[in-house]
Interface confidence: low
């Protein structure tokens, strides 16, 4: 069957990295610079992706595979195949339409991407707060108050904090 198909379609003999050149009697020609064909039998090669601007090259284009991009420092990939680069924020912040904003009280973000998430509610599990939460870290839950030995006490939940940069009124 393969042999029959080859006789009918000379292009099926062209391997990846080449194209079947109709202008040259269907000879298998190498893909031109900055192009590739990832499968055999193709009549043209595809233009390589260019990792420019906020993108940088993670994997160079070859004659048989496209380039792969990631993001320059200060940005991270979003979407299939790193289709977009989104700005990093600091830990304790989230990216909004107006830029990086600190996490609201009661929420945290321990990464440079993503959104601020609520602190764990220790009391839902019958536990107490062992270590207070911050903008960058979740609370650490300790044993339930009933499990504590006499004289021991857990850290009391923090009082509502002021937003950073605000002085007492």
């Amino acid at each position: 069957f393969e042999r029959t198909r080859s006789l009918q379609d000379p292009c099926s003999n062209c391997p990846a990295g080449t194209f079947c050149d109709n202008n040259r009697n269907q000879i298998c020609s190498p893909c031109p610079p900055n192009s590739f064909s990832s499968a055999g039998g193709q009549r043209t090669c595809d233009i390589c992706r260019q990792c420019k601007g906020v993108f940088r090259t993670r994997k160079e284009c070859s004659s048989t595979s496209n380039a792969e991009c990631d993001c320059t420092p200060g940005f991270h990939c979003l979407g299939a195949g790193c289709s977009m680069c989104e700005q990093d924020c600091k830990q304790g912040q989230e990216l909004t339409k107006k830029g990086c904003k600190d996490c609201c009280f009661g929420t945290f973000n321990d990464q440079k991407r993503g959104i601020c998430r609520p602190w764990t509610n220790c009391s839902l599990d019958g536990k107490s707060v062992l270590v207070n939460g911050t903008k960058e870290r979740d609370v650490v839950c300790g044993p339930s108050p009933a499990d504590l030995s006499p004289g021991a006490s857990s850290v009391t939940p923090p009082a509502p904090a002021r937003e950073p940069g605000h002085s007492p009124q």
Partner: nanobody
């Protein structure tokens, strides 16, 4: 003048099929990648499928894989989208777009495309 004109939209029942066409004029059609996007009411424009200028490389959004097929006829300067097993969530205005010769964005983002058609409405309902 670059022009893109979509056609083939209409109302169809779930499970039905439609074939969209995008007729291009005013430029060397065969030299550019082309794509279909769609926009449902109240939602952002969403990438559906893209076909390289050569026809040798295709890309689809996950939700249409196995149901939609993109193709092109460079001799007729026309891009196609064959849609089958249509679902209610496929209801949208479908746009064809021409890929820029160079873009800092990837193929799934609208910024990669410089010319757009006016759209054709596809409605899937019982």
């Amino acid at each position: 003048e670059v022009q893109l004109l979509e056609s083939g939209g209409g109302e169809v029942q779930p499970g039905g099929s439609l074939r969209l066409s995008c007729a291009a004029s005013g430029w060397a059609f065969g030299n550019y990648g082309m794509a279909w996007f769609r926009q449902a009411p109240g939602k952002e424009r969403e990438f559906v499928s893209r076909l390289a200028w050569s026809g040798g490389s295709t890309d689809y959004v996950e939700s249409v894989k196995g149901r939609f097929t993109i193709s092109r006829d460079n001799a007729k300067n026309t891009l196609y989208l064959q849609m089958s097993s249509l679902r209610a969530e496929d209801t949208a205005v479908y746009y064809c777009a021409r890929q820029r010769s160079y873009s800092r964005y990837d193929i799934r983002t609208p910024q990669t495309y410089d010319y757009w058609g006016q759209g054709t409405l596809v409605t899937v309902k019982p």
